[in-house]
Interface confidence: low
C-alpha cells in the first residue's frame, strides 16, 4: 500500500463523502417526507411494527387504531407541510401517540413514567423498557383451512396481525426485513390456499419462515447489543471485517463508506427510528447497485430484484473472490518504518485498514476472530510505539496471532467430531450438561433454549468444508450467546454470565468456553414434582418431547452438578424407556404415576440424590 493513500484517506475521513449517502435536504415535515418516500403501505406497516415493539402487551385493535390516526395525520402533512404539528420530530409525534394509551400505567407499570419525560429522554426510556422475553402466550398455529379463510376474508388485517405478533415478541426485529418476511408470508398464503393439498403446500413454507425469522431476529439482536452496549466503534469494526470479507475487491475507501452508511441504518433501527431506517436501507441498496462494479461481482442478480428482495439479497450475498496476488501484510503493518507514525496520525483509520486488509485475505476466519487479531495488534502498537525501540518491540506481533487462530479451529474440530458422533439431539444434551455445570444459576428454560440453539451449530456448520466452518460456527455462536446475555440481563443471577457478557463483545465465546464447573454452586433441593410426568407428553411433537426431556436433564444437573456423563446418560436412557413404555400402555396415566415413582427412586439411587 502506498502511504500517500493513507494520508489521502485522512482527508477523506473528514470529508462529506465518508458521511455517506444520507445527507438529505432539510424537510419542513419529517413525517410527510417519510410518508412520501416509503409509500402508504410501508409507512403503515413500519409504524405498526414500531408501536408493537414499544407497547408489547397492547391488543392488536388498539395498535391498528393508533396507526390509522398517525397515517391520517401524515396525509394532512403531505398535503400541507406547514400544517399544525407537522414540523414535530417523529419521536415526538409517535411518543405523544403512545402516551395517549389509557391503560399504560396498569399494563406497563413504571414504563408509564416515560411519558412524563421530554424527548429525547422519553424515547430512550421507551427503549429501555423493551422486553426480550415478554410474557405473551405461545403462538399456536390454527388449522390450515381456518388460516386460509381468515386470509381470504380480510387479507390486510391478516397480514397486519402477522407483523404485530412478530414485532411484539421480537422488539428488536429488523423492521425493513420484517416487511420482506410479511411479503413472503402473503405469497405463501396466496399460492397455497388455492392448492389441492393446502397443508402440504403451506406448512413447510410457514416452518421455514418461522425458523428464518427466529434466526433473523437473533442476528439483529446482536447488532443492537453491539451498538447499545459496546458503542458505534464496536459495530463499525464488526462491519469493516464482515464487508471486507464479502467485498474483497472493493477499495478501503468504498468499504469505509458502506460501513458508515450501514452503521447509520442499524443505529436507526435499533433506536426505534424505523421509518428513517427503512428509507436509508433502501438508499443504501440503491447506492450499492449503482456502484456494484467497484464493490462486488456477485451483486448482479440481487440488483435485478424488487426493493425488499434486493436489500435482503445484498445482506446475504456470498463473498466475492479475493483479488489475485495480494501482497503480504507484514510489509505495511510490521516491517514499515512508518507504522507508529501512521498509527499515531489516525489510530482508527490505521486499525481500520489493518482490519480491512486482514479480513479480505481471510474469508476463512470468523469476524470475531478478526476483531481479536485487530485488538491484539492495537494493544501491541499502544505498548510498542511508546517503547525505546518500537520496531523491535512489535516485530513479532503476527506470532501472537497463532494461538488466537488455533483456539477456535481446535474448538470447532473437537465439537464437530462430537456432533458427528452423537447427532444433534445428543450433542445438544452434551451442551446442556456442559453449560448447566458452568452457570447453574441460570433459569432452566433459558439454559434449554440457549443450549438447543448452541447445539444447532453442528447441523448448520459442520457440513461445511474447513474454509467455511469457522465463520459459520463462531459467528453463529456469538449470536446465540448474545441471546443468553440479553435474557440474563433482564434477571441477572450469575456473576460469571454477567462477566462474560459485559467484558468484551468479541471474547464472549472464549469466555464461556473457559468457564469450568461452578464449584460455588449449592445444589438445588430435590423436588419429585419436577420429575413427575403425565400422559400428555405422548401427544407432543418430537421437538416438544425433546424439550421436556432436556428440561429434566437440566434439573437433574442442577440437583447433582457432580454427576458423571455416564450417570446422567443412564438416567436419561431410563427416562426415554419409561416414556416410550408408558405411551404404549393402555392406561397411560396410571403407568406414568407408578413407573414414574420407580424411575425417580432409581434415579435418586443412581445419582445419590
Amino acid at each position: 500500500m502506498k502511504w500517500v493513500t493513507f494520508i489521502s484517506l485522512l482527508f477523506l475521513f473528514s470529508s462529506a463523502y465518508s458521511r455517506g449517502v444520507f445527507r438529505r435536504d432539510a424537510h419542513k415535515s419529517e413525517v410527510a417526507h417519510r410518508f412520501k418516500d416509503l409509500g402508504e403501505e410501508n409507512f403503515k406497516a413500519l409504524v405498526l411494527i414500531a408501536f408493537a415493539q414499544y407497547l408489547q402487551q397492547c391488543p392488536f385493535e388498539d395498535h391498528v387504531k393508533l396507526v390509522n390516526e398517525v397515517t391520517e395525520f401524515a396525509k394532512t402533512c403531505v398535503a400541507d407541510e406547514s400544517a399544525e404539528n407537522c414540523d414535530k420530530s417523529l419521536h415526538t409525534l409517535f411518543g405523544d401517540k403512545l402516551c395517549t394509551v389509557a391503560t399504560l400505567r396498569e399494563t406497563y407499570g413504571e414504563m408509564a413514567d416515560c411519558c412524563a419525560k421530554q424527548e429525547p429522554e422519553r424515547n430512550e426510556c421507551f427503549l429501555q423498557h423493551k422486553d426480550d422475553n415478554p410474557n405473551l402466550p405461545r403462538l399456536v398455529r390454527p388449522e390450515v383451512d381456518v388460516m386460509c379463510t381468515a386470509f381470504h376474508d380480510n387479507e390486510e388485517t391478516f397480514l397486519k396481525k402477522y407483523l404485530y405478533e412478530i414485532a411484539r415478541r421480537h422488539p428488536y426485529f429488523y423492521a425493513p426485513e420484517l416487511l420482506f418476511f410479511a411479503k413472503r408470508y402473503k405469497a405463501a398464503f396466496t399460492e397455497c390456499c388455492q392448492a389441492a393439498d393446502k397443508a402440504a403446500c403451506l406448512l413447510p413454507k410457514l416452518d421455514e419462515l418461522r425458523d428464518e425469522g427466529k434466526a433473523s431476529s437473533a442476528k439483529q439482536r446482536l447488532k443492537c447489543a453491539s451498538l447499545q452496549k459496546f458503542g458505534e466503534r464496536a459495530f463499525k469494526a464488526w462491519a469493516v471485517a464482515r464487508l471486507s470479507q464479502r467485498f474483497p475487491k472493493a477499495e478501503f475507501a468504498e468499504v469505509s463508506k458502506l460501513v458508515t452508511d450501514l452503521t447509520k441504518v442499524h443505529t436507526e433501527c435499533c433506536h426505534g427510528d424505523l421509518l428513517e431506517c427503512a428509507d436509508d436501507r433502501a438508499d443504501l441498496a440503491k447506492y450499492i447497485c449503482e456502484n456494484q462494479d467497484s464493490i462486488s461481482s456477485k451483486l448482479k442478480e440481487c440488483c435485478e430484484k424488487p426493493l425488499l428482495e434486493k436489500s435482503h439479497c445484498i445482506a446475504e450475498v456470498e463473498n466475492d473472490e479475493m483479488p489475485a496476488d495480494l501482497p503480504s501484510l507484514a510489509a505495511d503493518f510490521v516491517e514499515s518504518k512508518d507504522v507508529c507514525k501512521n498509527y499515531a496520525e489516525a489510530k482508527d483509520v490505521f486499525l481500520g485498514m489493518f482490519l480491512y486488509e486482514y479480513a479480505r485475505r481471510h474469508p476463512d476466519y470468523s469476524v470475531v476472530l478478526l476483531l481479536r487479531l485487530a485488538k491484539t495488534y492495537e494493544t501491541t502498537l499502544e505498548k510498542c510505539c511508546a517503547a525505546a525501540d518500537p520496531h523491535e518491540c512489535y516485530a513479532k506481533v503476527f506470532d501472537e496471532f497463532k494461538p488466537l487462530v488455533e483456539e477456535p479451529q481446535n474448538l470447532i474440530k473437537q465439537n464437530c467430531e462430537l456432533f458427528e458422533q452423537l447427532g444433534e439431539y445428543k450433542f445438544q444434551n452434551a451442551l446442556l450438561v456442559r453449560y448447566t455445570k458452568k452457570v447453574p444459576q441460570v433459569s432452566t428454560p433459558t439454559l434449554v433454549e440457549v443450549s438447543r440453539n448452541l447445539g444447532k451449530v453442528g447441523s448448520k456448520c459442520c457440513k461445511h468444508p474447513e474454509a467455511k466452518r469457522m465463520p459459520c460456527a463462531e459467528d453463529y455462536l456469538s449470536v446465540v450467546l448474545n441471546q443468553l446475555c440479553v435474557l440474563h440481563e433482564k434477571t441477572p443471577v450469575s456473576d460469571r454470565v454477567t462477566k462474560c457478557c459485559t467484558e468484551s463483545l468479541v471474547n464472549r465465546r472464549p469466555c464461556f468456553s473457559a468457564l469450568e464447573v461452578d464449584e460455588t454452586y449449592v445444589p438445588k433441593e430435590f423436588n419429585a414434582e419436577t420429575f413427575t410426568f403425565h400422559a400428555d407428553i405422548c401427544t407432543l411433537s418430537e421437538k416438544e418431547r425433546q424439550i421436556k426431556k432436556q428440561t429434566a436433564l437440566v434439573e437433574l444437573v442442577k440437583h447433582k452438578p457432580k454427576a458423571t456423563k455416564e450417570q446422567l446418560k443412564a438416567v436419561m436412557d431410563d427416562f426415554a424407556a419409561f416414556v416410550e413404555k408408558c405411551c404404549k400402555a393402555d392406561d397411560k396415566e396410571t403407568c406414568f404415576a407408578e413407573e414414574g415413582k420407580k424411575l425417580v427412586a432409581a434415579s435418586q439411587a443412581a445419582l445419590g440424590l
Epitope: F401, L411, Q414
Partner: nanobody, 123 residues
Framework: QVQLLESGGGLVQPGGSLRLSCAAS????????MGWVRQAPGKGLEWVSA????????YYADSVKGRFTISRDNSKNTLYLQMNSLRAEDTAVYYC????????????????WGQGTLVTVSS
C-alpha cells in the same frame, strides 16, 4: 471443559533431570495460562511455573528459577516442565493446571486440574 493428563514423573537422584508432560484436551480459552503446581508431602500447594497464551511469557517461583523450564507445543496441546538440578525438596505431586489470567499472584485461581504425577528426588 479442559481435561489435563500429566506424565513423566518418577524416582530420580539429586542433581538429576526429569521432563513432565501434560496433554490438554477439550475446550481451551484464548487467554488461558497453563501452569504447574506441586504439593509436597504434608505441605500446602505451591505454584511452580506458568506460561501465558498468546504472548508465551513465562513465570517461575523463586525456588525453581534457573533450574526449571516451562514450554508448550500448541500443535500437540501439550505443556512441558523440564526439571534440571533436582533437589530433595522438589519431591512432590506435580499437577498441571489451567489458570486464570493472574498467574503472577501467589495463589492463582486454578480453573482446571490434572490428576497429578509423583516426582521423588532421593539417593
Amino acid at each position: 471443559q479442559v481435561q489435563l493428563l500429566e506424565s513423566g514423573g518418577g524416582l530420580v537422584q539429586p542433581g538429576g533431570s526429569l521432563r513432565l508432560s501434560c496433554a490438554a484436551s477439550g475446550v481451551k480459552a484464548i487467554n488461558h495460562t497453563m501452569g504447574w503446581v506441586r504439593q509436597a508431602p504434608g505441605k500446602g500447594l505451591e505454584w511452580v511455573s506458568a506460561i501465558r497464551t498468546p504472548d508465551g511469557s513465562t513465570y517461575y517461583a523463586d525456588s525453581v528459577k534457573g533450574r526449571f523450564t516451562i514450554s508448550r507445543d500448541n500443535s500437540k496441546n501439550t505443556l512441558y516442565l523440564q526439571m534440571n538440578s533436582l533437589r530433595a525438596e522438589d519431591t512432590a505431586v506435580y499437577y498441571c493446571a489451567s489458570v486464570g489470567d493472574n498467574a503472577g499472584s501467589s495463589s492463582p485461581p486454578f480453573a482446571s486440574w490434572g490428576q497429578g504425577t509423583l516426582v521423588t528426588v532421593s539417593s
